[in-house]
Interface confidence: low
């Protein structure tokens, strides 16, 4: 008789996909542009990513460190009216993109929180909750929340706002802390809260601390829900040399939890390659012709038209990964085991139930390495079998969905591989 | 050819109600935001109240806030204003207006408007 | 509350003479901005939308500049039909309009 079937866990939208945050609607449209209006025209981008949510702004009024002059309620007027976000969020819903608010509420000035007036501003705060879950949203962002007194009790009472009107809304908060212990505080008072961290940011280039970190983070979680990002607004390449971004998204798609990234990050979008671009928002690449100052400083596969064109492209791989991420059950919501792969590797399954099983291999190390599985890790229900097909390869040249035998597992320097096998009895 | 048509209109003592209600044919009504604006006798223009494509999301001016109740029934291709409380500077033409969110333009259909009086 | 502030109230001019109407708000509404016209026993139509661009089949004689507070409609040639009273308003935060003026033959 067939073994009965694993019950299906509860998903939430957020669990099926990642989430693309536009921080800066001028960076991201460029060319003097950056309004509500133009954002709309770029939702089908955003559809071709395979995303699930946007996480836009802040765009609220904000005069800089202002607390009388900071609506939370009105957006300001060079991005947009109430009418053009009601239009984006029409549009959004109508391509299946839930579109989240920053309300971080002194984002043009030096400390996001007001610092001296907490209450004032946290009462602010849940008017907006209230105000724009009536108007549709379907959650928030706030950022910085190291630099908020009692940040967990005033998460603990937006959290209740923003659930308490529509379990399939979310709460994301926002910290620079890299420390496990004072994230591990922030979340154990919100159940349900998404917090995005600088946790991964300095993991540097091994295997082995990355392992460690990752580990470490969903055992001291437990089954809670979380996201991967390696910053609360950065992009990648602000942390990462170029040789280890396909490596990272790869492994940020195949984690357990939602993968958060920044507008860019799917080109490999970096400010230091833009001479007088800010670090934190430089203008998107949308083609050659994005980033006039300099004549010639852009070529076509630093931009979304020249790789959108190359199938062997950063941004190719994003969708791919992305399109993998939203329908594979095993990648939704599956169990996740690491065990040991040799020095320099950091190595997963994936699996749920009888469904198509996954294999990551991710080698951080600037040489080629062979990958030594250590199987006796990994309990039984995650069994290896001695061969997996290759599903993608962060690098070219590999015949994808060919058979490679485990033990004798090779990868180039700074490859990353996605193996897929079926669930045998 | 597009038509908005208001209707719910009349005499109404002061502290009484009345439900105003809007008939849209000729547009695709759930793509467009709706607004009731009033205009009292020999006056100018009055913003009263926004709702959105969706009824998510609704705006009230000052003067009507907690008294007045804007809604919408995108099957039924209708718009209404639930008016309680009436005063008599409540007085006024009703016009309802779609705004077409899609290409984020103003309020280009306009009903011919419904005659609300307030008096004892 | 965004209030917009109409000049003149009245404005007598004959036909074929130019006409220049302003509109201030009391804070930054960008571009969004509109201007309607009003005839008597009539329900407003749009001219101008986003400060400066015209609305379907208003003819070029209309037209509006402006952006942040300080707001103009120009009618450059005033026809018969031209005369009547005219509204700007905002979008910007929900809605406000202006308190009117109104163009009259002289």
């Known amino acids: 008789r067939a073994p009965r079937c694993r019950e299906l866990p509860a998903q939430k939208w957020w669990h099926t996909g990642a989430l693309y945050r536009i921080g800066d609607l001028q960076a991201f449209q460029g060319h003097g542009a950056g309004n509500l209006a133009g954002l709309k025209g770029r939702l089908d981008y955003l559809s071709s990513l395979k995303v699930k949510g946007l996480v836009l702004g802040p765009i609220h009024k904000n005069q800089k460190d202002d607390v009388a002059q900071t609506d939370l309620l009105q957006i300001d007027p060079n991005f947009g009216s109430k009418e053009d976000f009601d239009s984006l969020l029409q549009s959004a819903k109508k391509k299946s993109i839930r579109v989240i608010l920053d309300l971080t509420p002194n984002y043009r000035g030096e400390n996001s929180w007001f610092s001296t007036q907490v209450d004032t501003v946290a009462t602010k705060v849940k008017d907006a909750l209230e105000f724009w879950l009536q108007a549709g949203v379907d959650g928030f962002q706030v950022r910085d929340i190291e630099n908020l007194k009692d940040a967990s009790s005033f998460l603990a009472e937006w959290q209740n706002i923003t659930k308490g009107f529509s379990e399939d809304r979310l709460l994301i908060a926002g910290t620079n802390s890299s420390d496990l212990q004072q994230i591990l505080s922030l979340l154990e008072s919100n159940k349900d809260l998404l917090l995005t961290s600088s946790y991964l940011s300095d993991s540097g280039s091994t295997g082995e601390h990355t392992k460690s970190l990752v580990t470490q983070y969903l055992n001291a979680t437990g089954n809670r829900w979380c996201s991967w990002s390696l910053s609360q607004a950065r992009l990648l390449t602000s942390f990462l040399p170029a040789q280890l971004l396909r490596l990272y998204q790869l492994m940020l798609f195949t984690l357990p939890g939602t993968p958060v990234f920044s507008y860019g990050d799917e080109i490999g979008l970096d400010a230091a390659a833009l001479p007088g671009q800010p670090m934190e928002a430089p203008v998107m690449l949308w083609d050659e012709s994005s980033f006039p100052d300099i004549p010639g400083a852009v070529s076509a596969n630093m931009t979304v038209k020249g790789q959108s064109e190359d199938p062997g492209s950063l941004l190719s791989l994003f969708r791919r990964l992305s399109d993998q991420r939203s329908k594979e059950r095993s990648l939704l919501h599956g169990d996740f085991h690491a065990f040991s792969a040799g020095p320099g590797l950091f190595s997963y399954i994936r699996h749920w139930d009888q469904n198509e099983r996954f294999l990551v291999v991710l080698n951080f190390g600037d040489v080629g390495l062979s990958a030594g599985l250590q199987a006796s890790d990994l309990p039984a229900s995650a069994s290896l079998p001695a061969k997996a097909d290759l599903l993608l390869s962060t690098q070219p040249g590999r015949e994808e969905g060919s058979p490679l035998e485990l033990e004798r597992l090779k990868l180039e320097p700074h490859e990353g591989l996605l193996l897929r096998f079926p669930y045998a009895a | 050819e597009v038509q908005l048509v208001e209707s719910g209109g009349g005499v109404v003592r002061p502290g009484g109600s009345l439900r105003l209600s809007c008939a849209a044919s000729?547009?695709?009504?759930?793509?467009?935001?709706m607004t009731w604006v009033r205009q009292a006798p020999g006056k100018g223009l009055e913003w009263v109240s926004t709702?959105?494509?969706?009824?998510?999301?609704?705006g009230y001016a000052d003067s009507v806030k907690g008294r007045f109740t804007i809604s919408r029934d995108n099957a039924k291709n209708s718009l209404y204003l639930q008016m309680n409380s009436l005063r008599a500077e409540d007085t006024a033409l009703y016009y309802c207006?779609?705004?077409?969110?899609?290409?984020?333009?103003?309020?280009?259909?306009w009903g011919q408007g419904t005659l609300v009086t307030v008096s004892s | 509350e965004i209030v917009l502030t109409q000049s003149p109230a009245t404005l007598s001019l004959s036909p074929g003479e130019r006409a220049t109407l302003s509109c201030r708000a009391s804070?930054?509404?960008?571009?969004?901005l509109a201007w309607y016209q009003q005839k008597p026993g009539q329900a407003p139509r749009l001219l101008i939308y986003d400060a400066s661009n015209r609305a379907t089949g208003i003819p070029a004689r209309f037209s509006g500049s402006g952006s942040g507070t300080d707001f103009t409609l120009t009618i450059s040639s005033l026809e018969p039909e031209d005369f009547a009273v005219y509204y700007c308003q905002q979008r910007s935060n929900w809605w406000t309009f202006g308190q009117g003026t109104k163009v009259e033959i002289k």
């Open positions: 804070q930054s509404v960008s571009s969004y």
């Open positions: 709702i959105s494509w969706n009824g998510g999301g609704t």
């Open positions: 207006a779609g705004y077409c969110i899609i290409t984020g333009c103003y309020a280009d259909y």
């Open positions: 000729g547009f695709t009504f759930d793509d467009y935001g």
